[in-house]
């Protein structure tokens, strides 16, 4: 026996109290399957989130975050503050990368900068809070006769003292 | 067609806990089912509830702190994820009937289990 | 969230008397009507004795009737018995993903 409740397309639901009748979803729900016996409620974008697309009777709201925050987790399921380039989010706010680590995006965490010497390498270019360092070759790899780089110290960036 | 909650039990702070309600005469998939609780002296309180479908959706202050699953057609879970103190109630199970055809959770919550008590203590 | 304000408990009539507790919303309920009434005695979970604000559940007796719409809603108990003796919930439904339902504080109904 086929179940009466297949027949019900999405955007409606199978009444359970009314012969298995198919009735539209109430407004504020949706149902994104055939055959559903209860309609899903509306997700709603208030606060930090703002609607990216309406509910409709056979598919969900869905948020993004405002300006000054961006999406975390599935669906956008929170929103995260934004920091600038060469900070990270903590439990006290946006907080300025400590020296050794930078990060050059919005959002994330601050990385250490990339240990040249472990690849054999020299720092061509110094890290900042936004920039991660620039490896060069080694002296051994420079060819006979090419001029000599001394590759510069890590100096630290003025402003950025060790924390 | 009865409702039945077992699990509560006595556990320290932090123990995560898992409640299960089995219902007997319906399936879930019918159904939107809700979790209220009532701790010693105090009123009724709304946790949450998921839709027949299985989407679930949570009091505010509820959020983060208790997740309801469904391991079933006939068993449904919620889980206190890190219970404190204030999480002593006892926490009932019950289907929403629905009984003007809504399609939706209309707070005609009927039938209630017997409850089950979760006790949080050091 | 929406706050649902019951009458002041506890409310106290006699045997055959009438008792009256309203349930006053700060938000409109859904379709206006989507409140629901339920008794709570100690030991006991909650009954349900009126859904969509007015209607009687299935063998709740004709001496409770549920009223109003919108944020004020109204349980009449008339016909007191001494069983009636118990507290009463209000619960209102919202359109909302969280906070879906809020319930009254409860109102204490004692017979005398």
């Known amino acids: 026996l086929q179940d009466p409740c297949s027949n019900c397309p999405a955007g409606t639901f199978c009444d359970n109290n009314r012969n298995q009748i198919c009735s539209p979803c109430p407004p504020n729900s949706f149902s994104s399957a055939g055959g559903q016996r209860t309609c899903d409620i509306c997700r709603q974008c208030k606060g930090v989130f703002r609607t990216r697309k309406e509910c409709s009777s056979t598919s969900n709201a869905e948020c993004d975050c405002t300006p000054g925050f961006h999406c975390l987790g599935a669906g956008c399921s929170m929103c995260e503050q934004d920091c600038k380039q060469g900070q990270e989010l903590t439990k006290e706010g946006c907080k300025d990368c400590s020296f050794g680590t930078f990060n050059d995006e919005e959002h994330g965490v601050c990385r250490p900068w990339t240990d040249c010497s472990l690849d054999g390498k020299s720092v061509l270019v110094n890290g900042t809070k936004e920039r991660d360092v620039v490896c060069g070759p080694s002296p051994a790899d420079l060819s006979p006769g090419a001029s000599s780089v001394t590759p510069p110290a890590p100096a630290r960036e003025p402003g950025h003292s060790p924390q | 067609q009865s409702v039945e909650e077992s699990g509560g039990r006595l556990v320290t702070p932090g123990t995560p806990l898992t409640l299960t309600c089995t219902v007997s005469?319906?399936?879930?998939?019918?159904?939107?089912m809700t979790w209220v609780r009532q701790a010693p002296g105090k009123g009724l309180e709304y946790i949450g509830i998921m839709s027949g479908s299985g989407s679930t959706y949570y009091a505010s202050w509820a959020k983060g702190r208790f997740t309801i699953s469904k391991t079933s057609s006939t068993t449904l879970e919620l889980k206190i994820t890190s219970p404190t103190t204030e999480d002593t109630a006892i926490y009932f199970c019950?289907?929403?009937?629905?009984?003007?055809?809504?399609?939706?959770?209309?707070?005609?919550?009927?039938?209630w289990g017997p409850g089950t008590l979760v006790t949080v203590s050091s | 969230a929406a706050v649902l304000t019951q009458t002041p408990s506890p409310v106290s009539a006699a045997v055959g008397g009438t008792v009256t507790i309203s349930c006053q919303a700060s938000?409109?309920?859904?379709?206006?009507?989507?409140l629901s009434w339920f008794q709570k005695k100690p030991g006991q979970p909650p009954k349900l004795l009126i859904y969509s604000a007015s209607s009687l559940a299935s063998g709740v007796p004709s001496r409770f009737k549920g009223s109003g719409s919108g944020t004020q809603f109204t349980l009449t108990i008339s016909d007191l018995e001494s069983d009636d003796a118990a507290t009463y919930y209000c619960?209102?439904?919202?359109?909302?993903?969280?906070?879906?339902?809020?319930f009254g504080g409860g109102t204490e109904v004692v017979v005398k």
């Open positions: 619960t209102g439904r919202y359109n909302s993903d969280t906070d879906t339902f809020v």
């Open positions: 005469g319906f399936s879930l998939s019918d159904y939107y």
């Open positions: 938000q409109s309920v859904v379709g206006n009507s989507l």
């Open positions: 019950a289907r929403d009937g629905d009984y003007a055809g809504w399609g939706y959770a209309t707070g005609a919550f009927d039938p």
